[in-house]
């Protein structure tokens, strides 16, 4: 079954390569187990950047290798992606799955365009 997912259209990463955005889903029921996946769509590729499963009210548990962290509050997930560089600029899509209890629901956001600007190197001091 389909579900609406909202996320910001554009986010600018910090000078330290950190980008945060909120992924909000319209839960049709009272889900107790939720899975959130961040997809990057760019360079003619689709990459699962990170994924987390969480029980409502608990911390997000990301798969190992994750460059993401996050917290949840109700039907909102606050996601942070770290270690970004200019070449990581792209469309980051939030995918939400309500795993339990049945029925299963799937929602995919329209994506957040994350812009990353590499900081200028500090000039040499005399």
């Amino acid at each position: 079954k389909a579900m609406h997912v909202a996320q910001p259209a554009v986010v600018l990463a910090s000078s330290r390569g950190i980008a945060s955005f909120v992924c909000e889903y319209a839960s049709p029921g009272k889900a107790t187990e939720v899975r959130v996946t961040v997809l990057r769509q760019a360079d003619s590729q689709v990459t699962e950047v990170c994924a987390a499963t969480y029980m409502m009210g608990n911390e997000l548990t990301f798969l190992d290798d994750s460059i993401c962290t996050g917290t949840s509050s109700g039907n909102q997930v606050n996601l942070t992606i770290q270690g970004l560089r200019a070449m990581d600029t792209g469309l980051y899509i939030c995918k939400v799955e309500l795993m339990y209890p049945p029925p299963y629901y799937l929602g995919i956001g329209n994506g957040t365009q994350i812009y990353v600007i590499d900081p200028e190197p500090c000039p040499d001091s005399d």
Epitope: D43, A51, D65, I81
Partner: nanobody, 125 residues
Framework: EVQLVESGGGVVQTGGSLRLSCAAS????????MGWFRQAPGEDREFVAA????????AYADSVLGRFTISRDNANEMAYLQMNSLNPEDTAVYYC??????????????????WGQGTQVTVSS
């Protein structure tokens, strides 16, 4: 480095399926991000798919999304590429590759320092 040997290539008709296998040895397999690449005659080598060290995260080229599935079996040090709905444009030599790096946003650009010898896939119309 890890040693990689591909198998499973062959000739198949349009719409058919193949499953490629990549056997690894020499180093701890679970420390490597695994990728599949392909190279058609006269073309550059191109990224097909990649999978994280745990197997939980994957990446695909748009051209194979929904048709190909990458997977891995860390216990048996194997990586796989299930290829369905094959078409003549999929004809190429397919290479398995290993990168000793964690996951990120652009696995197609990881430094893959170990490569197999390749296995030929030919899709006839």
């Amino acid at each position: 480095e890890v040693q990689l040997v591909e198998s499973g290539g062959g000739v198949v008709q349009t719409g058919g399926s193949l499953r490629l296998s990549c056997a690894a040895s020499g180093r701890t397999f679970s420390m490597y991000t695994m990728g599949w690449f392909r190279q058609a005659p006269g073309e550059d080598r191109e990224f097909v798919a990649a999978i994280s060290r745990s197997g939980g995260l994957k990446a695909y080229a748009d051209s194979v999304l929904g048709r190909f599935t990458i997977s891995r079996d860390n216990a048996n040090e194997m990586a796989y590429l299930q290829m369905n709905s094959l078409n003549p444009e999929d004809t190429a030599v397919y290479y398995c590759a290993a990168a000793p790096v964690p996951w990120g946003t652009r696995p197609s650009h990881f430094t893959y320092d170990s490569w197999g010898q390749g296995t030929q896939v030919t899709v006839s119309s």
